[in-house]
């Protein structure tokens, strides 16, 4: 019925508008509706204009695709001509009243079927039903597999290929591990697979700048080191370096009015020369403070070295030695004054004696037959040395003495000349200034070491050697080497070190043989204003330790092997170092930073006196330790 209607309409159109010309009302009668008439009539007029007599040639040259008026007019009502739908995507085109409808093939959408439906993004069929890759194509889609997989017969699912089974030699000497879609050639940690040689090669991590400062590569690994001597330690990431930080601040205030007598480990701290009228007599007044028991305070001599006077400390008491053409004497007396308090000392040459007073009270009177120093040419010329004497004097002393004295003097008045000129000299030199407050002990400032020669061999014992160490420590930084035994070949067969613990505000103590930690005492609160007492006993068979928290004998699988290394070193010659290490490689020990803080050391029952060391860094204080810095209200 519908096609009959169309045929009737076509006949009417032919009769009314092609065989004859029609106006809009006549056209309305053909279509019997406004939308089609409104669509048809302007296009009908275009056809008429194109095919009027005389314009045919021009029309043929124009864009009009129709050969004659009939074709031109007949095509107007057909919305599907020319085809408005996308050829690839449409199934059919339906002509409507001044409109068209494109019916799309599956996989296409849009008014003209111009858009491909992305089946891969269909929420009702996730990923197009593909197990791996969904490839959208115009009007369709297909599934594919990733590398290392094969497609199953259902054309949707993928199966892994086991390359290790297919080619057993695929990894050479490395281990082949099959993984989904691929395989891996596995090497032990610290090794990298070489595709060319099909083998595992050591990774040189050091060439990859893994470490901030020093790096040591070894097969299968690497270790980072930091320059402890410059105040660095290894950070927790075991790669970067950080400054060894202060955990217990000390009061390091000094005053230039206080002369430090232990500025040099060996040598005089100050030398003065006096030229006075011949009637002058020797006199020295000063306040003196020390915890040291022995050492030279002052040495005075005549210009020709023929007469001399030594004011020293022995056993904590004042000792005077003198020698001139008339006499040679040594006297010790008075109370013990190495008590850390300021003591006023005066030594005055009287007509027939030398008077020594402490706190203005006479403690010694030494008779003398004549003047101490002989004047020449009407002048008394005297040389005065503080905290030492010229080297040649050592052999002339009535009784030998260790000249090193860790102490301070203030308010000095020599030869009744006051402090004339001395303060100005001291003021310029910071290292001649004394600490304002000190306590008993030895202080390691974190910049140097002391060396001792100790014989650890015990002939009477079956063990052959033993090291019994007692440490009383009050560290100021949480990292540093406290004690080390160093072999001639620059290895460190035994060391006791301090390291900051991973747990906050506590420290670990490491016992190491060469660069291996044999024992770690964890999380001790050592950075406090109280001293901590530690004891270690080691021989070729055993290692015992005692800390504030426990006493134990250490034994583990590897210990005997490490003790054997130590035993071998101890049978040769070892040097003992306190406060750090000499110039050994960074990698010689787990810790290489200098110890910073107070420490007193007893080895095999002998209290070590830093004044007796073979060598000692000038900044180490043998018998004085700075006080803990106390926060005041206005600081």
């Amino acid at each position: 019925a519908n096609s009959l209607l169309e045929e009737t309409k076509q006949g009417n159109l032919e009769r009314e508008c092609i065989e004859e010309l029609c106006n809009k009302e006549e056209a309305r009668e053909v279509f019997e509706n406004d939308p089609e008439t409104d669509y048809f009539y302007p296009k009908y007029l275009v056809c008429l204009r194109s095919f009027q007599t005389g314009l045919f040639t021009a029309a043929r040259q124009s864009t009009n695709a129709y050969p004659d008026l009939r074709s031109c007019v007949n095509a107007i009502p057909d919305q599907c001509s020319p085809l408005p739908c996308n050829e690839d995507g449409y199934m059919s085109c339906k002509d409507g009243k001044a409109s068209f409808t494109c019916t799309c093939k599956p996989g296409w959408q849009g008014e003209k079927c111009e858009f491909d439906i992305n089946e891969c993004k269909d929420p009702s069929n996730i990923n197009g039903g593909c197990s791996q890759i969904c490839d959208n194509t115009p009007g369709s889609y297909h599934c594919s597999c990733k590398n290392g997989f094969v497609m199953l017969s259902n054309k949707k699912d993928c199966k892994d290929v086991d390359e290790c089974s297919l080619k057993p030699s695929i990894c050479g000497t490395a281990v082949c591990k099959n993984i989904p879609g691929d395989f891996e050639c596995e090497c032990p940690e610290g090794y990298r697979y070489n595709l060319k040689s099909k083998s595992c090669e050591d990774i040189d991590e050091c060439s990859e700048n893994m470490c901030a400062q020093l790096c040591v590569n070894y097969p299968g690994g690497y270790t980072c080191y930091c320059d402890g001597k410059k105040g660095f330690k290894l950070a927790q990431d075991q790669k970067s370096c950080e400054v060894v930080s202060v955990c217990l601040p000390l009061n390091l205030d000094t005053k230039y009015e206080l002369l430090y007598l232990a500025e040099q480990f060996a040598g005089v701290v100050l030398y003065l020369k006096f030229r006075l009228p011949e009637i002058s007599r020797f006199s020295a007044e000063f306040d003196f403070r020390t915890y040291d028991s022995e050492g030279v305070i002052l040495y005075a001599e005549s210009i020709d070295h023929s007469a001399w006077l030594l004011i020293a400390l022995r056993g904590g008491k004042i000792e005077v030695q003198l020698k001139n053409e008339h006499t040679s004497k040594i006297t010790t007396g008075g109370d013990v004054i190495n008590n850390g308090l300021w003591n006023m000392v005066s030594v005055e040459e009287l007509e027939h004696s030398i008077s020594i007073k402490i706190a203005k009270e006479a403690v010694m009177d030494i008779n003398k037959p004549g003047p101490l120093f002989k004047p020449e040419n009407g002048l008394l010329e005297t040389k005065v040395y503080f905290a030492g004497f010229p080297r040649k004097v050592e052999s002339e002393l009535i009784k030998p003495i260790n000249p090193r004295l860790d102490g301070c003097i203030r308010s000095w008045n020599l030869m009744k000349q006051g402090a004339s000129g001395i303060k100005e000299i001291i003021q310029e030199k910071q290292n001649k200034h004394c600490l304002v407050t000190v306590e008993k002990g030895s202080y390691y400032p974190g910049s140097g070491i002391a060396q001792f020669h100790i014989d650890y061999n015990n002939v009477s014992s079956a063990e052959g050697w033993h090291v019994n160490v007692t440490l009383n420590i009050r560290p100021s930084t949480g990292t540093g080497v406290m004690l080390a035994l160093v072999s001639g070949n620059n290895t460190v067969p035994f060391a006791v070190s301090l390291v900051d613990s991973t747990s906050e505000k506590s420290q670990d103590i490491l016992l190491s043989v060469e660069n291996t930690v044999i024992y770690r005492i964890q999380a001790l609160s050592l950075c406090s204003d109280q001293q901590s007492h530690l004891e270690f006993r080691v021989n070729r068979n055993n290692l015992e330790l005692s800390t504030p928290l426990k006493i134990e004998t250490i034994s583990h699988e590897d210990l005997q092997r490490q003790l054997a290394v130590l035993d071998k070193a101890m049978k040769a010659k070892v040097a003992t170092y306190l406060g750090g290490l000499p110039d050994v490689p960074f990698s010689a020990t787990p810790v290489n930073a200098f110890y910073n803080g107070c420490m007193e050391v007893n080895i095999n029952g002998v209290q070590l006196d830093l004044d007796e060391a073979i060598s000692k860094h000038n900044d180490i204080r043998a018998h004085s330790c700075p006080s803990v810095w106390k926060k005041t209200k206005n600081s």
Epitope: G110, E114, D116, N136
Partner: antibody, heavy 120, light 110 residues
Framework: QVQLQESGPGLVKPSQTLSLTCTVS??????????WSWIRQYPGKGLDWIGY???????YYNPSLKSRVTISVGTSQNQFSLKLISVTAADTAVYYC????????????WGQGTLVTVSS | QSALTQPASVSGSPGQSITISCTGT?????????VSWYQHHPGKAPKLMIY???SRPSGVSNRFSGSKSGNTASLTISGLQAEDEADYYC??????????FGGGARLTVL
Amino acid sequence: QVQLQESGPGLVKPSQTLSLTCTVSGGSITSDGYHWSWIRQYPGKGLDWIGYIYYTGNTYYNPSLKSRVTISVGTSQNQFSLKLISVTAADTAVYYCARRLSTGPYFDYWGQGTLVTVSS
Amino acid sequence: QSALTQPASVSGSPGQSITISCTGTSSDVGGYEFVSWYQHHPGKAPKLMIYDVSSRPSGVSNRFSGSKSGNTASLTISGLQAEDEADYYCSSYTRSSTVVFGGGARLTVL
């Protein structure tokens, strides 16, 4: 990475024909599913879709411009072109070429645009 | 006169969220899921930010999201950043098989 670059005269006289070419690099103009489009932006910042073409030659035009516009494709040079006849000052705009996705009227890659001024 | 209506300008402070609306008719925005959003920094090529109303192309931050209700589509930008300052255009397919754009909204990050 697909890149598009417009080229052509920046000044066209009224009633003459505006001709622009878009060169595609980093991808083929014959890639399945992609249509190649022209869009313009008037000085007042409004965007206007002109039309698009498939490499086979199928074209879709904005009905308001259909009588004046022709988009063609040159597959060998990896280019497509725009011709707009009988231009007026109202056709002054920044003309962009762009790639249209197969799955919708979405333009995922655009050229930088070229300003065409219609003036005598 | 653009077929789709957008506010001329929107603004927000860094870290805030803003929404740009795009209103059309049942013949465009309301009739299809073919709605997209473009970001345009002046002097640069426009960039497709959202398609199919709410889908994001790869490489576009998840701070950008799209939605639609009736004849109005919306673009929301959360955690606003200085680099988001640009012109934003919405676009829709129409019943007459054409593509129409909004007039553009200038986003200012205060």
